[in-house]
């Protein structure tokens, strides 16, 4: 008797999961020697622990516990970088600037970052035809519930001075849906954060607005300043420019405002 | 080009631990890139793939072996080992090691293999 | 009894096309690669990736691999294409890579 699937409205798993997980771990632990204790057979079995025979609108942090228990690993708590709506150029930064880290830095982010993943109650199968969208479906999936978990614990982690990217383009430049506004901003620890210092990114080369004046970028200081942290602001007019001063600090156009 | 040479005892007694290496020449085990796997062929038989190591020391088992395999690796001398424990009559197999890439599966250079039965 | 499944032997006559299935659950989500193995040989990476073929093996090997099943077809085949061919991939459910139980090729004549 063939067997119903629910169909549902998201991408299904991404193509070769199992092995590019696999694969990542393996980079990951040759790229960052202090994780060369990890044993990337049980961090897979973990990770697949925590969603298959198990249904994708039902997941639950306590579900990843045991990955995250595997994924533990020190980050200097003052030299993060959150980042929402613009992770490319997150990405870049961390890449040139080396002693900071995102949440894709670290080894569980980097793992499943830009992967789809998800299986299907009461049967071994990994599901690579949908999976639960956020919004259409269901809040509680797989995909949703990891990064919830993840980034919070980041966010928990953090300490002095917390860094956010934020994107000037966008018309919510601060969103309370996103990952950052809805988990990462209400879990930094206050008696261990000093300060949150949003960097807004600018898309446009004429665009030399305050971008730090925005009404949704006052919400977030409203938020953080509640929570007893300080909160500052810069533009980043020009986020190539600001990309190749990173790398070349000493270049005399660079003590100019980016 | 790389090549790779098994070489070991070819008679294991039953309940005892088989001990293979793999020499690499040719190309340094260190250079990345690449995973270093043990395969087995029973006789007459078709492939099973038993495990692999990284250079880095990463390993992954075949899950239904992985309570008696361990693949280790000794960069300094360019080779890697396998290691089956509690062997029985059914371990008996041509055993090969073989290079393959990080997606898994593409073994491109492969040993000669070196048969090993199991008996008292 | 492996998880993916081949046809234990095909038969073609020399210059006729010869394809070889190997069957699984999702294997198109996965890639699939291909061996070639002789009597008393060592096995012979002829496919990877599906359908990308290593230096050194003649174009008339190609590959696809799509839904549950992934073929290796061998077109003007050559009487020195008799072996035993083997695919090989990973497998969810046993979660490792697992070959196909081999497919012997005979080329008639």
């Known amino acids: 008797v063939p067997r119903w699937r629910q169909q549902w409205s998201g991408p299904g798993t991404t193509k070769r999961f199992p092995e590019t997980v696999l694969a990542r771990c393996v980079k990951y632990t040759e790229i960052h020697p202090e994780m060369r204790h990890v044993d990337c057979q049980s961090v897979w079995d973990a990770f697949k622990g925590a969603f298959i025979s198990k249904h994708p609108c039902n997941i639950t942090e306590e579900d990843y516990q045991p990955l995250m228990k595997l994924g533990t690993q020190t980050v200097p708590c003052n030299k993060i970088l959150l980042w929402s709506r613009i992770k490319d150029l997150a990405h870049q930064f961390t890449q040139v600037q080396r002693d900071m880290f995102t949440l894709e830095d670290t080894l569980l982010g980097y793992l499943a970052d830009d992967l789809t993943w998800c299986g299907e109650f009461n049967t071994s199968k990994i599901n690579y035809q949908s999976c639960p969208d956020w919004r259409k479906d269901c809040s509680n999936n797989p995909v949703s519930v990891f990064w919830k978990t993840v980034s919070r614990r980041f966010a928990e982690a953090a300490c002095d001075v917390v860094h956010v990217m934020l994107n000037g383009s966008r018309s919510k430049i601060f969103d309370k849906n996103s990952t950052f506004g809805s988990v990462e901003v209400h879990n930094l620890q206050p008696e261990k954060v000093q300060t949150l210092e949003a960097w807004v990114i600018h898309g446009g080369r004429e665009d030399s607005r305050d971008l730090c004046q925005d009404p949704t970028i006052k919400e977030l200081e409203s938020i953080i300043s509640k929570r007893n942290i300080q909160f500052s602001c810069k533009n980043i007019y020009r986020p190539d420019k600001f990309l190749q001063c990173v790398k070349n600090p000493e270049d005399s156009s660079c003590t100019s405002e980016i | 080009k790389v090549q790779l040479q098994e070489s070991g005892p070819g008679l294991v007694k039953p309940s005892q631990t088989l001990s293979l290496t793999c020499a690499v020449s040719g190309g340094s085990i260190s250079s990345g890139g690449y995973y270093w796997s043990w395969i087995r062929q029973h006789p007459g038989k078709g492939l099973e793939w038993i495990g692999y190591i990284y250079y880095s020391g990463s390993t992954y088992y075949n899950p239904s072996l992985k309570s008696r395999v361990t693949i280790s690796v000794d960069t300094s001398k360019n080779q890697f080992s396998l290691k089956l424990s509690s062997v029985t009559a059914a371990d008996t197999a041509v055993y090969y090691c073989?290079?393959?890439?990080?997606?898994?599966?593409?073994?491109?250079?492969w040993g000669q293999g070196t048969l090993v039965t199991v008996s008292s | 009894q492996s998880v993916l499944t081949q046809p234990p032997s095909v038969s073609v006559s020399p210059g006729q096309t010869a394809s070889i299935t190997c069957s699984g659950d999702n294997l198109g989500d996965h890639y699939v690669c291909w061996y070639q193995q002789r009597p008393g040989q060592s096995p012979v990476l002829i496919m990877y990736e599906d359908t990308k073929r290593p230096s050194g093996i003649p174009d008339r090997f190609s590959g696809s691999n799509s839904g549950n099943t992934a073929t290796l077809t061998i077109s003007g085949t050559q009487t020195m294409d008799e072996a035993d061919y083997y695919c090989?991939?990973?497998?969810?459910?046993?979660?490792?890579?697992?070959f196909g139980g081999g497919t012997q090729l005979t080329v008639l004549g």
């Open positions: 073989a290079r393959g890439g990080v997606m898994g599966g593409d073994f491109d250079y």
């Open positions: 090989v991939a990973w497998d969810d459910s046993l979660s490792g890579w697992v």
